[in-house]
């Protein structure tokens, strides 16, 4: 019987009965938070052979071994993991051994065995026989091996029954408990599983089998299971499901996700029956089970229960991440914030359509609305009093709406209103009228010419660059000297520059009124000589990198027809010269014959130009005499070269701090102090432990279902 989806056994140990007929758990198995010590000997689930996701054990009092509960658990597939782990054993106070003596394969993910004060038989299990990679395993804070005295079957009687393998240069017997060896298949089987009698299974079997070379006798399948047979791929008209079996169209058409309160149904894509279309694809119509590629970003409709979504912080903007259509009204009220422009772009930058109105008020942190970089349609299905669908009031630092040269925005219904935006030029508003198709809709008082733009240099002259010179890390630029009507009004110039891989930047990118700015700024004083053109040397730049540069004149608040005159240049794109590339990365060499070396490498991290070729140099080295010192035909005489691994065994150090002999006459001395790198590694380790524990608690402590 296939059980699932995901089984959570908590609080009451008798819930274990739910596992009675399970052969496969399709999903995870949690056994946790059973605080009363019970006698688990009467509970045994020999039918359970496979868990498709992960196994999590946490705070189960009285449970001493898993071997009696799950004697035949053979495979944990790890199709979905718990924080990168397929097996988690955490704070199991009474567990003495793992004892899963038939566990042969963890297909994906690592193991985490932590804070189990009584747990032994950890160093006797060779996890490399079960997992592909053991480097991510985390086995910490269990009973110290010295206190365990783990003995494999037959060792005491000097008739060892288990096989030996090498772990960390220790060649030893491998077992799960005092009477259960760790099963190993003959080397002739290669990567294949084997029967209890060491006969090789069919290549499509995983873990074990009941008969050799038979794809219907597998305990679990390497790839997929269909109609009693292990198959390398699902047959025609069937689809991969949950990472391990094949199902037909009818099955897929009638299932819903239990994680959602909608009934959207599964889809078939790329031969798989899955909950959602993958990234970049969308359902092909409401009744369709199939996915088609999206044109551009995939549409995602977001709806606000209360009709109007107030964006007053990054947190509230976060709720709109990925939304392309917003059903409702947007009220933007950003008074302060850190790096606000780029944060808002990150979370709201995909919105293309707002069905109601957009209102921006008291948003003193905003310099531009360019964070709504994909907004193309305001439908105005709902409007503010006075029939406004775009309303901009009292934004003290708002200088730009959008870059109208690269923006099409339509306001389908409703009027616009602008008032008390002192840095927003009226010309910018008039331009928006033209682009959005609202010209003629507004009445006279809707766009206030007195209090919009009264503190901005709205009549701008254009500064022209006169020369540019580049080297590998410098740019020299000069520009025409600007001459306002009264030369005393010109104070200085400000040069803005930044890296720009593409020629698509605007003056207001990443800029907000709270100090965040993606542009670097340099002030340039006026040259004392009136005939000399102003200029600047920008240094410390990266080689072969395109930069965007523009210049602004800093002028006095000189009012002419109610507006300040100013000047700025167009944005200029300049690339620095090429330079020597950084060194090639990850150089590896290996010999594939007595006269050849194969050398591989990755490109340099900083090419500093267009790479055209590499130069490979080599030279002959003298042979290492060490290789000739030993008779390699005598197995016992092979010296093991131990390399320092850069870590300190903390236990050893604390127990006996004066054991290191410093050589010569010096005698014993104290353990070396920890290096900065070691301290940092320990700090990161402690942090990682906390993060995992938080994740565990957040995942398992959930409100009771209604």
């Amino acid at each position: 019987e296939i059980c699932g989806p995901g089984i959570d056994i908590r609080n009451d140990y008798q819930q274990l009965k739910r596992l009675e007929n399970c052969t496969v758990i399709e999903g995870y198995l949690h056994i946790l938070l059973i605080s009363k010590a019970e006698d688990y000997r009467s509970y045994r689930f020999p039918k359970l052979t496979v868990i498709t996701e992960y196994l999590l054990l946490f705070r189960v009092a009285g449970l001493e071994s898993l071997g009696d509960l799950f004697p035949n658990l053979t495979v944990i597939r790890g199709w979905k993991l718990f924080y990168n782990y397929a097996l988690v054993i955490f704070e199991m106070t009474n567990l003495k051994d793992i004892g899963l003596y038939n566990l042969r394969n963890i297909t994906r993910g690592a193991i985490r065995i932590e804070k189990n004060a009584d747990l032994c038989y950890l160093s006797t299990v060779d996890w490399s026989l079960i997992l592909d990679a053991v480097s991510n395993n985390y086995i910490v804070g269990n009973k110290p091996p010295k206190e365990c005295g783990d003995l494999c079957p037959g060792t005491m009687e000097e008739k060892p029954m288990c096989e030996k393998t090498t772990i960390n240069n220790e060649y030893n017997y491998r077992c799960w408990t005092t009477n259960r060896c760790q099963k190993m298949c003959p080397s002739t089987c290669g990567k294949r599983a084997c029967t209890e009698n060491n006969e090789c299974c069919h290549p499509e079997c995983l873990g074990s089998c009941s008969a050799p070379d038979n794809d219907t006798a597998c305990v679990a399948c390497r790839h997929y299971y269909y109609a009693g047979v292990c198959v390398p791929a699902c047959p025609p008209n069937t689809y991969r499901f949950e990472g391990w079996r094949c199902v037909d169209r009818d099955f897929c058409a009638n299932i819903l996700s239990a994680e959602s309160s909608d009934s959207e149904g599964f889809v078939i894509h790329d031969g798989e029956c899955m909950q959602e279309c993958p990234s970049g694809f969308i359902r092909n119509g409401s009744q369709s089970m199939y996915c088609i590629p999206c044109e551009g970003p995939c549409p995602k409709v977001c709806e606000e229960e209360k009709k109007t979504k107030t964006i007053d912080s990054v947190t509230s903007a976060q709720m709109l991440q990925g939304c392309t259509i917003f059903k409702g009204n947007l009220l933007i009220n950003i008074r302060r914030g850190n790096n606000i422009a780029s944060e808002l772009e990150n979370f709201m930058g995909l919105i293309e359509v707002v069905t109601g109105y957009v209102k921006i008020r008291h948003s003193h942190a905003l310099v531009s609305l360019s964070f709504l970089k994909n907004l193309r349609l305001i439908l105005g299905e709902e409007q503010l009093e006075g029939n406004y669908s775009f309303y901009v009031l009292d934004n003290q630092n708002l200088q730009q709406l959008w870059d109208w040269d690269h923006r099409n925005l339509t306001i389908k219904a409703g009027k616009m209103y602008f008032a008390f935006n002192p840095k927003l030029c009226v010309s910018e508003i008039y331009r928006m009228e033209e682009v959005t198709g609202t010209k003629g809709r507004q009445s006279k008082g809707d766009i206030n010419t007195r209090n919009n733009g009264e503190r901005a240099s709205c009549e701008s002259d254009v500064l022209h660059f006169t020369s540019t010179t580049t080297s590998k890390n410098r740019i020299i630029i000069t520009w025409h000297r600007y001459r306002p009507p009264d030369y005393r009004d010109l104070i200085s110039f400000t040069v803005y520059y930044k890296e720009a891989p593409f020629k698509n930047v605007t003056e207001y990118d990443g800029q907000d009124a709270c100090g965040s700015n993606s542009w670097n700024m340099v002030d340039v004083d006026l040259p004392p000589n009136k005939d000399v053109e102003p200029g600047i040397l920008l240094h410390g730049l990266k080689p072969w990198t395109q930069y965007a540069v523009y210049v602004k004149a800093v002028t006095l608040t000189m009012v002419e027809n109610d507006h300040i005159r100013g000047a700025k240049s167009e944005i200029l794109y300049i690339r620095t010269n090429a330079s020597v590339p950084s060194i090639p990365l990850d150089v590896l060499s290996a010999s594939n014959s007595s006269s050849q070396l194969i050398v591989k490498w990755n490109p340099p991290s900083l090419p500093n130009g267009n790479l055209s070729y590499y130069i490979v140099r080599w030279q002959r080295q003298p042979q290492d005499g060490y290789l000739y010192r030993h008779n390699y035909c005598s197995k016992d005489k092979i010296p093991i070269r131990k390399y320092a691994d850069g870590t300190i065994d903390i236990e050893e150090v604390t127990e006996n701090p004066k054991t290191e002999v410093c050589g010569g006459e010096k005698g014993p001395c104290c353990a070396c102090p920890k290096t900065e790198a070691e301290k940092q590694a320990e700090k990161e380790e402690a942090e990682y432990r906390k993060v995992f524990e938080n994740f565990l608690h957040n995942s398992i402590f959930v409100p009771r279902p209604e």
Partner: nanobody
């Protein structure tokens, strides 16, 4: 508090039609999947039809395919079941149900465990 009220049931002759309605309150109707179930005397409750919230994708039991049509009007917070070509075996109490989040994994649309809220039911009798 979530409330579901079914209406539209009654006595109808074989081959006749009925339209059931289910009005919901206490929830954001437009975000929940919904379904109709029925229970005939002495039988288990069975799924008749279901509909999703976001796209309106529909599901039908084989026994009613081509005869029944499920629909919803989110602006009126109402779910409908149009029943045509009724047969004697359609006699049952018809219940309206609202989806709820129910842990991990998946379930078939006609599994009662996927639904968290239920109406009191409306009786449909098909008899000549």
């Amino acid at each position: 508090e979530v409330q579901l009220v079914e209406s539209g049931g009654g006595l109808v002759q074989p081959g006749g039609s009925l339209r059931l309605s289910c009005t919901a309150s206490g929830l954001t109707f437009g975000t929940f999947g919904m379904a109709w179930f029925r229970q005939a005397p002495g039988k288990e409750r069975e799924g008749v039809s279901a509909i999703s919230a976001s796209s309106g994708r529909t599901y039908y039991a084989d026994s009613v395919k081509g005869r029944f049509t499920i629909s919803r009007d989110n602006s009126k917070n109402t779910l409908y079941l149009q029943m045509d070509a009724l047969r004697a075996e359609d006699t049952a109490v018809y219940y309206c149900a609202v989806r709820s989040k129910n842990g991990a994994g998946y379930g078939f649309w006609y599994e009662a465990r996927l639904y968290g809220y239920w109406g009191q039911g409306t009786l449909v009798t098909v008899s000549s």
